[in-house]
């Protein structure tokens, strides 16, 4: 009689993640008399998948009815397939014995489980950077297999391509992630900008999985300042502007100084927002000329989103026919927390002079 | 390793019924077919039936079919054969014997229940 | 039903020597290359135990002087040099349908 064959027919097979996977085995043989069981890998670490002789297995079913006659097919079915069940597995044939005797192996079948990546996480710098600086976003995917795996970074549809992307680990594993840093230059724009993080892999059949960070959470965009001069009113008061402009985020507060002191203290709150996210808010000082004997200098300070404040200067002539002067001051840190009223208007898109 | 073992010794009347128990051990109870035979005494062995205990198909020999059944519980793993309208002749060994290669043969048995038929 | 005829139904052979027994049957027990006949042995007061399985294969742990051969409807047992443990009852069986017992011989030592 020829030799016994354990026939594994497939070299590899490919399951999805929760699905079943059949083992396909037959003997070529009903000599000799013995059972056949089921290995994940070789040698003596190898591991029990199956013994139609004896044991439980309950994720595993045998495909043919064991009991049947003269039964030569010992394939098997693996219900619930995870990227853990990834392997080489052998079909073994024993010789019936006290204990049984292993006799021959098939030739292995590679199980490699199709495991989808986890939704894309993006996150974005832990504090806000200015307008015209870089920042890093990062973004995770877990639990995808097989290895290959694509990511891309948009900006507003734009792919990124300052970008570093690893999958770990290196070697094999049972599944993998993916890690992806993308530097961003921010511009005064980006407040309603949007990045995209987006994963294709095998197991998405081309509808990849994306996700998003908004620029928002991650930009201060800082104000322009102009202070001016109304004309002389009847009552020689002097209406004197500050408009605060083209600002993100809403949290700023702006201080009057006259002649160095504090004049009022305003905090910004519910202001309308610009077509491109970011605020204005105007702030005006009334001046009673009479009341001075000298040159008034005004002082609209602002201090925006915790950064230091910015200071835009204006004096008010005290003289028959006034004559409007601004002039820049170096930053002073001079603001107070003392609230004072706080009126505004939108005065959006005019040319103004930029002070940091 | 396989293991069969029988419910003792039987004396019955004429008209009777015994029920024979085996239970099964080291190895997949539900995996292998179980046959029963019976050898009276100084006689050859006769093939009474066989039963899957994963599905309670049986075969039988035409000779008992009408007074013979064959059952399993599984959460036990223990085949019984019963047997009715017991006559004189009936007296024998009963054997359990477990299919091991799936062909109809009798791999390992277990040690025998005497059966007594005597009025 | 096929029916199983063993031949001779006692025999004595010496020690040493070769003990052939034989087991016909009415009809072929052959099917897609496999012969359906097994040999049993049965010592006095214990269940038979299995010898030979498929007309020529030895169930494990047989002594090698046990062999069988065969096909179609005749088959012959032969122990190659009889040793005294091989006093026994030997029986054959066929499963090619139902399964069925030969009426079993005798061998003793001479």
């Known amino acids: 009689e020829e030799e016994l064959q354990v026939i594994q027919p497939e070299k590899s097979v490919s399951v999805a993640a929760g699905d079943s996977a059949t083992l396909n085995c037959t003997v070529s043989s009903l000599i000799p008399v013995g059972p056949i069981q089921w290995f994940r890998g070789a040698g003596p670490g190898r591991e029990l998948i199956y013994n139609l002789k004896e044991g439980h297995f309950p994720r595993v079913t045998a495909v043919s009815d064991p009991t049947k006659r003269n039964n030569m097919d010992f394939s098997i079915r693996i219900s619930n397939i995870t990227p853990a069940d990834a392997g080489t597995y052998y079909c073994v044939k024993f010789r019936k014995g006290s204990p049984d005797v292993e006799l021959k192996s098939g030739a292995g079948t590679e199980l490699s489980v199709r495991a989808k990546p986890s939704a894309p996480v993006v996150s974005g710098p832990a504090v806000r950077a200015t307008a015209e600086h870089t920042v890093s976003f990062t973004c995770e995917s877990h639990g995808f297999s097989p290895r290959d795996i694509t990511l891309k970074w948009f900006k507003n549809g734009n792919e990124l391509s300052d970008v570093q992307t690893n999958v770990d680990p290196a070697g094999k594993s049972v599944s993998y992630s993916i890690r992806s840093t993308a530097r961003v230059l921010l511009t005064r724009r980006d407040v309603h900008s949007q990045v995209i993080c987006e994963v294709a892999h095998v197991t998405l059949q081309g509808d990849p999985l994306r996700g998003t960070a908004n620029l928002s959470e991650a930009i201060r965009v800082p104000p322009f300042l102009e202070v001016t001069q109304q004309s002389m009113r009847a009552d020689n008061q002097v209406n004197v502007t500050c408009q605060v402009t083209k600002f993100y985020p809403q949290r700023l507060q702006l201080t009057w100084l006259e002649n160095g002191n504090v004049s009022r203290t305003e905090m910004a709150s519910a202001l309308p927002e610009n077509k491109d996210g970011t605020y204005n808010w105007t702030s005006w000082l009334l001046v009673n000329v009479s009341a001075h004997r000298d040159d008034v200098k005004l002082t609209c300070q602002v201090e925006h989103d915790g950064q230091p404040a910015v200071n835009k200067s204006f004096s008010v002539k005290v003289s028959a026919h006034p004559k409007e002067q601004g002039s820049n001051t170096a930053a002073e840190n001079t603001g107070t927390n003392e609230r004072g009223s706080s009126d505004y208007k939108d005065d959006d898109d005019k040319h103004h002079h930029h002070h940091h | 390793q396989v293991q069969l073992v029988q419910s003792g010794a039987e004396v019955k009347k004429p008209g009777a019924s015994v029920k024979v128990s085996c239970k099964a051990s080291g190895y997949t109870f539900t995996n292998y077919w179980i046959n029963w035979v019976r050898q009276a005494p100084g006689q050859g062995l006769e093939w009474i039936a066989m039963i899957d205990p994963s599905d309670s198909e049986t075969h039988y020999n035409q000779i008992f079919k009408d007074r013979a059944t064959l059952t399993t519980d599984t959460s036990t793993s223990t085949a019984y054969m019963e047997l009715r309208s017991l006559r004189s002749d009936d007296t024998a060994v009963y054997y359990c014997?477990?299919?091991?290669?799936?062909?109809?043969?009798?791999?390992?048995w277990g040690r025998g229940t005497l059966v007594t038929v005597s009025s | 039903d096929i029916v199983l005829t063993q031949s001779p139904d006692s025999l004595a052979v010496s020690l040493g020597e070769r003990a052939t027994i034989n087991c016909r049957a009415s009809k072929s027990v052959s099917s897609s290359g496999y012969n359906y006949i097994f040999w049993y042995q049965q010592k006095p007061g214990q269940p038979p135990k299995l010898l030979i399985y498929?007309?020529?294969n030895l169930d494990s742990g047989v002594p090698d002087r046990f062999s069988g051969s065969g096909s179609g409807t005749d088959f012959t047992l032969t122990i190659s040099s009889l040793q005294a443990e091989d006093v026994a009852v030997y029986y054959c069986?066929?499963?090619?349908?139902?399964?069925?017992f030969g009426q079993g011989t005798k061998l003793e030592i001479k």
């Open positions: 069986q066929h499963s090619r349908e139902l399964p069925t």
């Open positions: 014997a477990m299919d091991y290669g799936s062909l109809y043969a009798m791999d390992y």
């Open positions: 498929l007309a020529s």
